[in-house]
């Protein structure tokens, strides 16, 4: 007979999860010559022991330390690129940008971005049926502690320039329950980090707002400023016009404003 | 960029001892697991071991497990092979090579020493 | 151990014609994810180099005229088109156990 398992709301676990986090792990081992001494049993081991065989609405940051100790890694001052709601305009900058990196850049956030993952308390198995979500379970599920136990260690590992995208089509251009908002932003270290500099993505082609006055932006300012760290804000009213400048600088068109 | 450099080949008489060494530079030494493997004259490779980051694990092949023993001094970014016990049949090319654990290939080898088993 | 038995022992090639070498592990040498099966290349008086590792993936800085192939005990290096650089001894690899074996080596040469 089949056992009884537990019905979450969310989706499951992506299928072939193990060998997805494997392949990813050694593929940017290959992209990533400087992390060849990672070893990608171990760290699919440590993933695995982070939620495997533990009730997945009970799951801690602490669960995810052997993971997050083999994956450390250290981004260069002034080379950290968070963001919020506007994850494949950022990712398209750090492909062209090389030198800058958001949290999907590094290892940890290259193995599990846009993956579900669960398992069931006392066996070890995964739950390919589904997993709990974040609203109608519990917030203290494997992929959001993951997220949030990583991002709170990417934002404390920055310094120099902190720069942030933002999403200026949205109601709320900074959201403080956004992970950048709750998270990010509160793990910031004001003895690394000399500034943050906002970059507000506009949507429409024909939208001259200075979004940087939008009433979330001044509150993130002064989060921001309370925590002795300067912030700077910047219009991006061409997206398409911003990545090409970032791909081509010579270009003509790229010496007047984006 | 990354280097290998073995040295402390040369002639040794059968029964003989010899400490061979390998020089790394370019990389973390000691992140990574480190390999000796050989070749004779004209023959193919021959895998001898590899050892881990902080030495606590060191896998030899099995017919030279109590004759060739391997250790390292990451502060010296030095890789070692202790040959005792010397036959004509261990006289080779030995080279070191780093090991991408997450693949188990062998990414980068050095240019290798030579040892020469002779009375 | 894992025997891995390559053959042919040699071969010679045309320039830009296809050059297939193949390797035979005693045993699986796969598991779900990967095939532990590397390709290196040694020119005459140097060390090998890595060409293709997991059985099919090419190292950086390898020409894409190198391919490999294969899963379970069977893989194939293949080289296409063959260039005249590309006169070596090609050895198979293991590492999906200890020991850690190699093939017995391929000599290509141009015809």
């Known amino acids: 007979l089949p056992r009884w398992r537990q019905q979450w709301s969310g989706s499951g676990t992506t299928s072939r999860f193990p060998e997805t986090v494997l392949a990813r792990c050694v593929k940017y081992t290959e992209v990533h010559p400087e992390m060849r001494h990672v070893d990608c049993q171990s760290v699919w081991d440590a993933f695995k022991g982070a939620f495997i065989s533990k009730y997945p609405c009970n799951i801690t940051e602490e669960d995810y330390q052997p993971l997050v100790k083999l994956g450390t890694q250290t981004v260069p001052c002034n080379k950290t690129l968070l963001w919020s709601r506007i994850k494949d305009l950022a990712h398209q900058f750090t492909q062209v940008q090389r030198d800058m990196f958001t949290l999907e850049d590094m290892l940890l956030g290259y193995l599990a971005d846009d993956l579900t993952w669960c398992g069931e308390f006392n066996t070890f198995e995964i739950n390919y049926q589904s997993c709990p979500d974040w609203r109608k379970d519990c917030s203290n599920n494997p992929v959001s502690v993951f997220w949030k136990t990583v991002s709170r260690r990417f934002a404390e590992t920055a310094c120099g320039v902190v720069h942030v995208m933002l999403n200026g089509s949205r109601s709320k251009i900074f959201d403080k329950n956004s992970t950048f908002g709750s998270v990010e932003v509160h793990n910031l270290q004001p003895e690394k980090v000399q500034a943050l500099e906002a970059w507000v993505i506009h949507g429409g082609r024909e939208d001259s707002r200075d979004l940087c006055q939008d009433p979330t932006i001044k509150e993130l300012e002064s989060i921001i400023s309370k925590r002795n760290i300067r912030f700077f804000c910047k219009n991006i009213y061409r997206p398409d016009k911003f990545l090409q400048c970032v791909k081509n600088p010579e270009d003509s068109s790229c010496l007047s404003g984006i | 960029q990354v280097q290998l450099l073995e040295s402390g080949g040369g002639l040794v008489q059968p029964g003989g001892s010899l400490k061979l060494s390998c020089v790394a530079s370019?990389?973390?030494?000691?992140?990574?697991?480190m390999n000796w493997v050989r070749q004779a004259p004209g023959k193919g490779l021959e895998w001898i071991g590899k050892i881990n980051p902080d030495s606590s694990t060191i896998n030899y092949t099995p017919s030279l497990k109590d004759k060739f023993f391997i250790s390292r001094d990451n502060a010296k970014n030095t890789l070692y092979l202790q040959m005792t016990k010397v036959r004509s049949e261990d006289t080779a090319l030995y080279y070191c090579?780093?090991?991408?654990?997450?693949?188990?290939?062998?990414?980068?080898w050095g240019q290798g020493t030579t040892l020469t088993v002779s009375s | 151990e894992i025997v891995m038995t390559q053959s042919p022992a040699s071969l010679s090639a045309s320039l830009g014609q296809r050059a297939t070498i193949s390797c035979r592990a005693s045993?699986?040498?796969?598991?779900?994810?990967?095939?532990?099966v590397h390709w290196y290349q040694q020119k005459s008086g140097q060390p090998p180099k890595l060409l293709i590792y997991?059985?099919?993936n090419l190292e950086s800085g390898v020409p894409a005229r190198f391919s490999g192939s294969g899963s379970g005990t069977d893989f194939t290096l293949t080289i296409h088109p063959v260039e005249s650089e590309d006169v070596a001894t090609y050895y198979c690899?293991?590492?999906?156990?200890?020991?850690?074996?190699f093939g017995s080596g391929t000599k290509l040469e141009i015809k």
């Open positions: 045993s699986s040498v796969s598991s779900s994810a990967f095939s532990y």
């Open positions: 370019g990389f973390d030494f000691s992140l990574y697991w």
């Open positions: 690899h293991h590492s999906r156990e200890l020991p850690f074996t």
């Open positions: 997991l059985a099919s």
């Open positions: 090579a780093r090991l991408w654990i997450a693949t188990g290939g062998f990414d980068y």
